[in-house]
């Protein structure tokens, strides 16, 4: 049994880091493998992660952490029974993938303005809380070409757009994702999408 693709890990910078790797053949990850992880700290102890299958030869493990600070470093040991298959380390602050925003809501009762709001996925005491920026994706269910991205570079989790920038009388969907420049993170996953019917009064034509 050998590791074909070494574990790579990303952290949500809150409580979970996810590590993925590939074995050289079909593997029952949860029965055959264990990933031991330990914070490099005098009084820490090793924790065991039981991996799950992620495709035939792929494995994924969700490492639980109390919290994360920038100085944290973890040692990782991948075991198959008594055999050490791979040894490495992981610094969560250098491999951050933020949590996805939630509770995306489209408010259509503001006159001719669409107000999209969502929730910051972090609690106020987390470092990323004040460092997230967002991308909002809006697309038409009827027209695949009607697909747009709005970059929200301010901290407030909301976006206002004129309803008239979208076609009237058809249904749209929106979703949002986050990233943090301070840690050069990857983008989060997209939030669940939300749907609404876009309708607004056309202005009277002047003749």
């Amino acid at each position: 049994m050998k590791v074909l693709q070494e574990p790579t890990c990303v952290s949500d910078y809150m409580s979970i880091s996810t590590c993925e790797w590939k074995m050289n053949g079909p593997t029952n990850c949860s029965t055959e493998l264990r990933l031991l992880y330990q914070l490099v700290f005098l009084l820490s102890e090793a924790h065991t992660c039981i991996p799950e299958n992620n495709g035939g030869a792929g494995c994924v493990c969700h490492l639980l952490m109390d919290d994360v600070v920038s100085a944290d470093n973890y040692t990782l040991d991948l075991w198959a029974g008594q055999q050490l298959l791979w040894k490495g380390s992981f610094k969560p602050s250098e491999h951050v993938k933020p949590r996805a925003p939630g509770n995306l809501t489209v408010h259509t009762n503001v006159s001719d303005t669409l107000l999209l709001t969502w929730s910051n996925p972090y609690p106020p005491d987390n470092y990323l809380y004040n460092h997230l920026t967002y991308a909002v994706n809006i697309w038409s269910e009827n027209d695949p070409a009607d697909f747009r991205i709005y970059n929200v570079t301010y901290l407030e989790p909301s976006l206002r757009i004129a309803a008239s920038t979208l076609k009237s009388g058809i249904s749209y969907r929106a979703r949002v994702r986050a990233w943090a420049q301070c840690y050069n993170t990857t983008w989060s996953e997209w939030s669940p999408s939300t749907k609404w019917h876009n309708s607004y009064r056309e202005p009277f034509e002047q003749h």
């Epitope: 700290f41 005098l42 009084l43 820490s44 102890e45 109390d66 600070v69 920038s70 100085a71």
Partner: antibody, heavy 116, light 111 residues
Framework: EVQLLESGGGLVQPGGSLRLSCAAS????????MAWVRQAPGKGLEWVSA????????YYADSVKGRFTISRDNSKNTLYLQMNSLRAEDTAVYYC?????????WGQGTLVTVSS | QSVLTQPPSASGTPGQRVTISCSGS????????FNWYQQLPGTAPKLLIY???HRPSGVPDRFSGSKSGTSASLAISGLRSEDEADYYC???????????LGGGTKLTVLG
């Protein structure tokens, strides 16, 4: 709410023994390392000993090595410090502290006086 | 003799910004993070800053920490009379498998 309550302090003669206890509540005791820190009257803080969450690893300051023993009972949510061969210079308030990277919660302390 | 050196005293007037230093000896390993504790008169110490610059919840943002090599600093801005206390720095020394604490700095708020 995290609470740490030390007990077992008192007056003891040089060469004598005492056992300090620290009762923990408000958090999952078995998931945290713990430590003892002391403060002699009018002096600064001095780290004494620390123990990992399972008790697998234990560390002592040179000044108490071989005389003090730290232990824990996770089923009772209690930390202990057995102090033998006590000296006058061990006179101090002894604090129990929870460890999360640093000493993030402290008890109110128990006074140990070593005097003849 | 502590391997972390702090000035024995510091002072400032209300509203001022005060900085307390904590210096490791030249041979002190610089891999560990610094922590800061506040001890108000007659009370148990309280964690103020951990991992160089992180504040536990409930600690006002007037308190901030920084690290440079084997030294650290605690800054208190908008000084208040209730900040009058002893301040200690500390760090894990992995070469000695121990926790080392500075000698403490007594902060006096004047006026």
């Amino acid at each position: 709410e995290v609470q740490l309550l030390e007990s077992g302090g008192g007056l003891v003669q040089p060469g004598g023994s005492l056992r300090l206890s620290c009762a923990a509540s408000g958090f999952t005791f078995s998931r945290h390392a713990m430590a003892w820190v002391r403060q002699a009257p009018g002096k600064g803080l001095e780290w004494v000993s620390a123990i990992t969450m399972s008790g697998r690893s234990i560390y002592y300051a040179d000044s108490v090595k071989g005389r003090f023993t730290i232990s824990r009972d996770n089923s009772k949510n209690t930390l202990y410090l057995q102090m033998n061969s006590l000296r006058a210079e061990d006179t101090a308030v002894y604090y129990c502290a929870r460890v999360h990277r640093a000493f993030d919660y402290w008890g109110q302390g128990t006074l140990v006086t070593v005097s003849s | 003799q502590s391997v972390l050196t702090q000035p024995p005293s510091a002072s400032g007037t209300p509203g001022q910004r005060v900085t307390i230093s904590c210096s490791g000896s030249p041979l002190f390993p610089d891999s560990g993070s610094f922590n800061w504790y506040q001890q108000l008169p007659g009370t148990a110490p309280k964690l103020l800053i951990y991992a160089d610059s992180h504040r536990p919840s409930g600690v006002p943002d007037r308190f901030s920490g920084s690290k440079s090599g084997t030294s650290a600093s605690l800054a208190i801005s908008g000084l208040r009379s209730e900040d009058e206390a002893d301040y200690y720095c500390g760090t894990w020394d992995y070469s000695l498998n121990s926790y080392v604490l500075g000698g403490g700095t007594k902060l006096t708020v004047l006026g």
